[in-house]
C-alpha cells in the first residue's frame, strides 16, 4: 500500500490492504478504493480491459475469468493495484491460445494461474512429447510462462502449460507456437538470363527469383535511371517453413528499340537489400557480322594444309551456312558450331579445312551465311606457293636461247655460262628479253615467266644454265655447246632440279 507524504498528492488506498487476494469461485469480490479524487477502477487480464467508475468494485459470484489485476486510479493519475486470484478447481489456467514469437526474442505463453498455490508451474510438450532440449522458460503465475530466446526450430511446437494441483498434474489447452523468423541475411536474387536480344515487336519476358525466410520480403523490377512502375506478375511458393520463393516476371509484350537498357530486380528485407540486373537490347531488324580469324589473303605452300576460320554474330539464329570455291559448294571438310552453349549465345564459328593443297587449288573461297533477316559473306583469297617448273627450254631459229618457267610467287630467271667442262656456272649472262606471260590471266594460278638470251655471244664450248627460282625453291635447265669449225651446235638440253 502507498505511503502518504503530506502536501503531495498520494496514490489511492485499496481495501483489503493486500497486494494479492485469493477468492474461491462463486464467492464475492469486494474491493474498495479510498481516495477523495477517485476516478476509476480498471481490470486487466490477457490484454482484456474493463473499467468501473464506482469506487467499490463488486463481483457477486466470482468466476475464474475474474482473475486479474484490479487498479484504482485517482484524478492525479496516481494508482494502486491488487491482484485477485479466483480459485476454480475446474479452471486452473486462463488462456489466450494465440502464441507468436519472434526468433531470438522472448515470447509469453499466456496461461496465468487462477490459483497461486499450485506447484510445478511449467511447460510440457503435447501428447507426452519432450520439449526441445534448449528451450528455456520462466514462469510467472500472474502473466504466464515466458519462453526465452525463441528458436526457428520451435515453429509449430505444440505445448501446454502445466501445474500440479493437489498432487495431480493439470494441463492447459494446447498452444501452437508460431515463430516469425529474424532476417539474418539479404534476400537471394537471381535472374532467368543476364542479357536479352530481341527484334522490334517481339515479347520481352524475364523472371527474377527471390528467396528468403518469409514472404515479408519486398521485391520489384526497376528500370535503371527511370521511375516508371513496371508491370510484373508474381508466383510464390513455400518450400517448407522459412523457405519462401517468389518469381517476379516482367513482361513487355511488344518491345521497341527505346525499351533497350538495364533492368534491375531489387529485393530487400529488414536485414538489407540485394539486386541483380539483366540487359535488354532491341534491334529494328536482325543482323549478321562476320569476323575472320585469319587474314583474308592466305599464302600456303604446295602440299600443306590451311584452315579458313570465321567467327560470326547472327541474330536471329543462322539458318543456312556454306563454303564455296569456283561456284562449287563444299559438302564436307567444314564445320559450324556455336561459340558457347549459353542460351543467349549469338556468336558462332565456321571452319573450312583445306588439306594438301595443290598449286591448282588457289583461288577465292567464300563463306556465306543467312538468317531470316539478312545474308552475309566473306571471301578468302588463297595463294598456293609452288616451286618453279621449267616448262620449255629451246634454241630458237634466230639464235636465241629461251627458257619458260612457271611458279608462284612469280619466278625469277637467271642465266649463267660455264666455259669448257666446268660444272659451276658463275658468269652471269644478262637476258635480252623477259616477259610475264599470263599476268592478265587467272589471278591465283602459277605465274609464267619467259626469258631469252642471245647465244651468239658465246665463242667457246661450254654449258649455259637457265635457273628459275622463287621463295619456295629453284630449278635449272642446261644447254651444252660444241663448236665444229665455225658452226655452233646445240647439244640436247637437260634439266637439273635443285630443291
Amino acid at each position: 500500500q502507498p505511503s502518504v507524504s503530506p502536501g503531495e498528492p498520494s496514490p489511492p488506498s485499496i481495501h483489503p490492504a493486500k497486494s494479492e487476494l485469493i477468492v474461491r469461485v462463486g464467492n464475492e469480490i469486494r474491493l474498495l478504493c479510498i481516495d477523495p479524487g477517485f476516478v476509476k477502477w480498471t481490470f486487466e487480464i490477457l490484454d482484456e480491459t474493463n473499467e468501473n467508475k464506482q469506487n467499490e468494485w463488486i463481483t457477486e459470484k466470482a468466476e475464474a475469468t475474474n482473475t486479474g489485476k484490479y487498479t484504482c486510479t485517482n484524478k492525479h493519475g496516481l494508482s494502486s493495484s491488487i491482484y485477485v486470484f479466483v480459485r476454480d478447481p475446474a479452471k486452473l489456467f486462463l488462456v489466450d491460445r494465440s502464441l507468436y514469437g519472434k526468433e531470438d526474442n522472448d515470447t509469453l505463453v499466456r496461461c496465468p494461474l487462477t490459483d497461486p498455490e499450485v506447484t510445478s508451474y511449467s511447460l510440457k510438450g503435447c501428447q507426452g512429447k519432450p520439449l526441445p532440449k534448449d528451450l528455456r522458460f520462466v514462469p510467472d503465475p500472474k502473466a504466464g510462462i515466458t519462453i526465452k530466446s525463441v528458436k526457428r526450430a520451435y515453429h509449430r511446437l505444440c505445448l501446454h502449460c502445466s501445474a500440479d494441483q493437489e498432487g495431480k498434474s493439470v494441463l492447459s489447452d494446447k498452444f501452437i507456437l508460431k515463430v516469425r523468423p529474424a532476417f539474418k541475411a539479404v534476400p537471394v536474387v537471381s535472374v532467368s538470363k543476364a542479357s536479352y536480344l530481341l527484334r522490334e515487336g517481339e515479347e520481352f519476358t524475364v523472371t527474377c527469383t527471390i528467396k528468403d525466410v518469409s514472404s515479408s520480403v519486398y521485391s520489384t523490377w526497376k528500370r535503371e535511371n527511370s521511375q516508371t512502375k513496371l508491370q510484373e506478375k508474381y508466383n510464390s511458393w513455400h518450400h517448407g517453413d522459412f523457405n519462401y520463393e517468389r518469381q517476379a516476371t516482367l513482361t513487355i509484350s511488344s518491345a521497341r528499340v527505346n525499351d533497350s537498357g538495364v533492368f534491375m530486380c531489387y529485393a530487400n528485407n529488414t536485414f538489407g537489400s540485394a539486386n541483380v540486373t539483366t540487359t535488354l537490347e532491341v534491334v529494328d531488324k536482325g543482323f549478321i557480322n562476320i569476323f575472320p580469324m585469319i587474314n583474308t589473303t592466305v599464302f600456303v605452300n604446295d602440299g600443306e594444309n590451311v584452315d579458313l576460320i570465321v567467327e560470326y554474330e547472327a541474330f536471329p539464329k543462322p539458318e543456312h551456312q556454306q563454303w564455296i570455291y569456283m561456284n562449287r559448294t563444299f559438302t564436307d571438310k567444314w564445320e559450324d558450331y556455336p561459340k558457347s552453349e549459353n542460351e543467349s549465345n549469338i556468336r558462332y564459328v565456321s571452319e573450312l579445312h583445306l588439306t594438301r593443297l595443290k598449286g591448282t587449288e588457289g583461288g577465292t573461297y567464300t563463306f556465306l551465311v543467312s538468317n531470316s533477316d539478312v545474308n552475309a559473306s566473306i571471301a578468302f583469297n588463297v595463294y598456293v606457293n609452288t616451286k618453279p617448273e621449267i616448262l620449255t627450254y629451246d634454241r630458237l631459229v634466230n639464235g636465241m636461247l629461251q627458257c619458260v618457267a612457271a611458279g608462284f610467287p612469280e619466278p625469277t630467271i637467271d642465266w649463267y655460262f660455264c666455259p669448257g667442262t666446268e660444272q659451276r656456272c658463275s658468269a652471269s649472262v644478262l637476258p635480252v628479253d623477259v616477259q610475264t606471260l599470263n599476268a592478265s590471266g587467272p589471278p591465283f594460278g602459277k605465274l609464267v615467266v619467259q626469258s631469252s638470251i642471245d647465244s651468239s655471244a658465246f665463242k667457246h664450248n661450254g654449258t649455259v644454265e637457265c635457273k628459275a627460282y622463287n621463295d619456295v625453291g629453284k630449278t635449272s635447265a642446261y644447254f651444252n655447246f660444241a663448236f665444229k669449225g665455225n658452226n655452233k651446235e646445240q647439244i640436247h638440253p637437260h634439266t637439273l632440279f635443285t630443291p
Partner: antibody
Framework: QVQLVQSGAEVKKPGSSVKVSCKAS????????ISWVRQAPGQGLEWMGG????????NYAQKFQGRVTITADESTSTAYMELSSLRSEDTAVYYC????????????WGRGTLVTVSS | DIQMTQSPSSLSASVGDRVTITCRAS??????LNWYQQKPGKAPKLLIY???SLQSGVPSRFSGSGSGTDFTLTISSLQPEDFATYYC????????FGGGTKVEIK
Amino acid sequence: QVQLVQSGAEVKKPGSSVKVSCKASGGTFSLYAISWVRQAPGQGLEWMGGIIPHFGLANYAQKFQGRVTITADESTSTAYMELSSLRSEDTAVYYCARGGLDTDEFDLWGRGTLVTVSS
Amino acid sequence: DIQMTQSPSSLSASVGDRVTITCRASQSINSYLNWYQQKPGKAPKLLIYAASSLQSGVPSRFSGSGSGTDFTLTISSLQPEDFATYYCQQGVSDITFGGGTKVEIK
C-alpha cells in the same frame, strides 16, 4: 480471447474506393498475419492478400495486384484493406482473418463487412 | 495459381452418417492444407490445419488426412450442427480455396 472487430457495411459507387478496418483486441498483433478474404453472394472464398504488421509488408493475390492496398497500424492493433476502382462484381462480404501468410492457417475470423457496389 | 478441386460439390446425409469430403490440389502442397466449416451468414471456422491436426475446441468426430495432392476431411458421425459448407485451402502458394462442399440434411 482475441477478437477481430470489423467496420460496418458500405455502399459504394462504381469507380470509387472502399476502406475497411479490422481491429484486433489483445494478443501479439504485430506478429499476426492479417489477411483479407472476400465472398461474393452465393460464392466461395477468395484470398485478396495479407500483412504481418511487424514486417510492414503486404502480399497480394495476383488478381488484386495494383487495386488493393493492405496496411496495419501497430499502435491501434488495426489492419486496413482499401480496394479501388470498384465494380459491381466487387459486391461481397469482406472478412479479415488471422493467418494466411507464411503457411499460417486462418484460425480467427472477423464477422465480415458487406460492401455493395451499385450505381 | 494452385487449383483446389473439392468433391462432391454437395451431398445429402443423415445424422449419424459417416461423411467424407475430398480435396485435390493441382500440384503438391505437402501438408499445407486446412479445412473450414461455414454456416450461412457466418464467418468460416477452422476445423483442421496442416492436413490432419485438429484445431482446439473442434469435436474429435472431425478428422483430416492426406499429403501431396490428395486430402480428405471425414466426419465420423454427422451431428445436426454439422450441416454447413466445408472448404479446403492450400497455403503453399498464393492462397486458394476449394469450391466448397455443401452438406445438407437428407
